[in-house]
Interface confidence: low
């Protein structure tokens, strides 16, 4: 399994991760949660600029989710509908992050308690949506590399999204189910 986002460092305010939120609970296809320029939220079958998200801890177990490309916060209406907002509303845009044992996470609106679900796509009724909250696998998203002065190797920053932030164990052998054969 991929290394989960279970590091104690992430339980405190201010910690930031760049992630793709991958789900295979989508009805028709695997998908990555995507916040688009027009404020709509959907699924991208493949990782895209709009699906690179910044997850920032607001307090223990509670995060905000920001679309890196669109600078829109993921927010949820009381009826469960998702949208991307240029303004952060703590009530609509704060999500409780619940870590599952298999490396997947479940996200719930802190205000309403509603689970985060991708908008349903057009799968026929015989490929039904799963019951219960959608599970998302946070896949690492690398921030854009800054140009380095010639001849200088910059050290890698610790990955606070990893249970091995200082890379003491070695490379993870986990891989996304997107690429399972």
């Amino acid at each position: 399994h991929p290394i989960p986002d279970s590091s104690p460092l992430l339980q405190f305010g201010g910690q930031v991760r760049q992630r793709y939120l991958y789900t295979d609970d989508a009805q028709q296809t695997e998908a990555h949660l995507e916040i688009r320029e027009d404020g709509t939220v959907g699924g991208a079958a493949d990782q895209s600029p709009e699906s690179l998200l910044q997850l920032k801890a607001l307090k223990p177990g509670v995060i905000q989710i920001l679309g890196v490309k669109t600078s829109r916060f993921l927010c949820q209406r009381p009826d469960g509908a998702l949208y991307g907002s240029l303004h952060f509303d703590p009530e609509a845009c704060s999500f409780r992050e619940l870590l599952l044992e298999d490396g997947y996470n479940v996200y719930q609106s802190e205000a309403h308690g509603l689970p985060l679900h991708l908008p349903g796509n057009k799968s026929p009724h015989r490929d039904p949506a799963p019951r219960g909250p959608a599970r998302f696998l946070p896949l690492p998203g690398l921030p854009p590399a800054l140009p380095e002065p010639p001849g200088i190797l910059a050290p890698q920053p610790p990955d606070v999204g990893s249970s091995d932030p200082l890379s003491m164990v070695g490379p993870s052998q986990g891989r996304s189910p997107s690429y399972a054969s």
């Epitope: 296809t29 026929p124 490929d127 997107s178």
Partner: antibody, heavy 117, light 112 residues
């Protein structure tokens, strides 16, 4: 990277059947649907049918009586079989992978099929 | 079946011009989930079609912003604000809301 590679005959005798295999890599058939589309000078682009990630199928009713789409997830292969071909079935046949909100993101290279004796 | 009718059949343009292609469906193409799966594809000679626009107006990743889609109900339009040489080819509309999915007959955009 994502690839769809088609293999199948270029020439089919009238009244015979056509079998094409679409072998995919870079993704799993358990996560995506695969469509079959053909293109002929006379009829343009025609959607023939698809197989969902679950293995369920949808067919164009115009071809349903002679078309079968199956797959083997473990081999990453999708199988297309059309029976009773006639001259007007001459076309380029494509397999293509869906996306989340759209249908044809990645395409096979196409198989030019000529129906002739 | 839903019939998709494209006009014009051929569209001669000068580079830098605006181009507009119309697509009309024989019935409303709203899926039972409320979305309209109207897509636009560009096919160049010897290539497979490439996705430009999905769900009426959403540009696919990497598609230049000179391409825009609009419409509702049964009438849809693809606009190219300033045609470039790489935009030449055959454009197809496609509906993926009702089985059998169907394509328009194509519009060939070519140099005047």
């Amino acid at each position: 990277q994502v690839q769809l590679i088609q293999s199948g005959p270029g020439l089919v005798q009238p009244s015979q059947s056509l079998s094409i295999t679409c072998t995919v890599s870079g993704f799993s058939l358990t996560g995506y649907a695969i469509h079959w589309v053909r293109q002929s000078p006379g009829k343009g682009l025609e959607w023939l049918g698809m197989i969902w990630k679950s293995g369920n199928t949808d067919y164009n009713a115009a071809f349903m009586s002679r078309l079968s789409i199956t797959k083997d997830n473990s081999k990453s292969q999708v199988f297309f079989k059309m029976n009773s071909l006639q001259a007007d079935d001459t076309a380029i046949y494509y397999c293509a992978r869906n996306g989340y909100d759209y249908e044809f993101v990645y395409w096979g290279q196409g198989t030019l099929v000529t129906v002739s004796s | 079946d839903v019939l998709m009718t494209q006009t014009p059949l051929s569209l001669p343009v000068s580079l830098g011009d605006q181009a507009s292609i119309s697509c009309r469906s024989s019935q409303i193409i709203v899926h039972n989930n409320g979305d309209t799966y109207l897509e636009w594809y560009l096919q160049k000679p010897g290539q497979s079609p490439k996705l430009l626009i999905y769900k009426i107006s959403n540009r696919f990743s990497g598609v230049p912003d000179r391409f825009s889609g609009s419409g509702s109900g049964t009438d849809f339009t693809l606009k190219i604000s300033r045609v470039e040489a790489e935009d030449l080819g055959v454009y197809y509309c496609f509906q993926g809301s009702h089985v059998p999915y169907t394509f328009g007959g194509g519009t060939k955009v070519e140099i005047k």
